[in-house]
């Protein structure tokens, strides 16, 4: 079972993503809050960490793939593993980090010039031409996210603004990031007080368009700091 693998000594001290993550080097995997881990002859308390479970690549983050945590392990026990960087071994495209693809068992850079035709061939071979099963999550088996594709229209799922068509940016919306319109003059914008604070937004706005900047609306100067309204204004 998933839990027996997660509790086995075999994965106790692996690096991320199995044995821990940033700030948790070598932490073991636990099966329940506060549970004790059988290490050697005595039990020891361990970090309350559990890898993300999955059955397919689409259930993992865009820079992860779904696989068994142990080589030749139980095929039914799978977790999300960190993607493989350039020149690392691979068995399929999803194993390679964004910007790379799997060629002859090695992750190689997806140079757009030669990559597109080659990847389309592979997809046709592997999945045929039946696109009836495509949905918003089929990003590993179609030309999206990891693979070159037509620029996303408004509302399309994206990873970065370069995935979106002209006049759109990639911004967070609920659980995903989608292409949203770049803000026009007079539209309300978000001014980030400190670097990185945009990461806390649930409905992220795009940036202001060319020649515009996000500034306090003139008639709102007297308002309190927290209620100041920012809009896109000409430089």
């Amino acid at each position: 079972t998933l839990n027996s693998v997660l509790n086995s000594n075999a994965i106790k001290n692996l690096p991320p993503p199995l044995g821990g993550a940033a700030g948790h080097p070598g932490s073991a995997v636990s099966a329940a809050p506060g549970i004790l881990y059988p290490g050697g002859n005595k039990y020891q308390t361990i970090d309350n960490y559990q890898p993300y479970p999955c059955a397919e690549d689409e259930e993992c983050g865009t820079d992860e793939y779904c696989a068994s945590p142990t080589r030749g392990g139980d095929a039914g026990v799978q977790i999300c593993l960190a993607c493989r960087k350039r020149r690392k071994r691979c068995m399929r495209h999803a194993m390679c980090c964004p910007g790379n693809y799997c060629k002859n068992g090695i992750c190689v850079s997806s140079d757009q010039n030669h990559f597109r035709g080659e990847i389309e061939e592979t997809i046709t071979e592997s999945f045929g031409n039946d696109h009836s099963t495509l949905d918003g999550y089929s990003r590993r088996t179609t030309l999206s996210s990891k693979m070159y594709h037509t620029k996303g229209q408004e509302g399309s799922v994206c990873l970065r603004s370069s995935d979106c068509a002209s006049g759109l940016c990639c911004a967070r919306h609920f659980w995903s990031k989608i292409c949203k319109p770049v803000l026009k003059e007079g539209q309300v914008c978000t001014k980030h007080r400190r670097k990185g604070s945009h990461g806390l937004e649930i409905f992220q706005r795009c940036y202001c368009g060319e020649g515009l900047s996000c500034r306090i609306q003139k008639d709102h100067h007297q308002a309190s700091n927290s209620s100041r309204l920012h809009t896109c204004q000409r430089h």
């Epitope: 821990g20 890898p51 993300y52």
Partner: nanobody, 116 residues
Amino acid sequence: EVQLVESGGGLVQPGGSLRLSCAASGFSLDYYGMGWFRQAPGKEREVVASIRWNAKPYYADSVKGRFTISADNSKNTAYLQMNSLKPEDTAVYYCAAGKRYGYYDWGQGTLVTVSS
């Protein structure tokens, strides 16, 4: 510090439905996974459902087609809609919030009892 508080558990008859809620505070979008796990008496904790940013939800085989995981980020709340409940679904249900590679933060749990 992240705090997760589950609610919505209780006693329900077989075939019935329940909706569990998990309210998160101190929650930042660095935590880009939310999940539901359960632990029946004398058994190991097992995953029920899990959802990641920009990804398809994961469901354990035993709950596929019966349970649905969702989230309302404006309320910082995750949900588990449980339909067609069976006696074997009886357990303490835990909500979890995940970081980069897995789940780190856990709620205290809410008891779900399926019995006639």
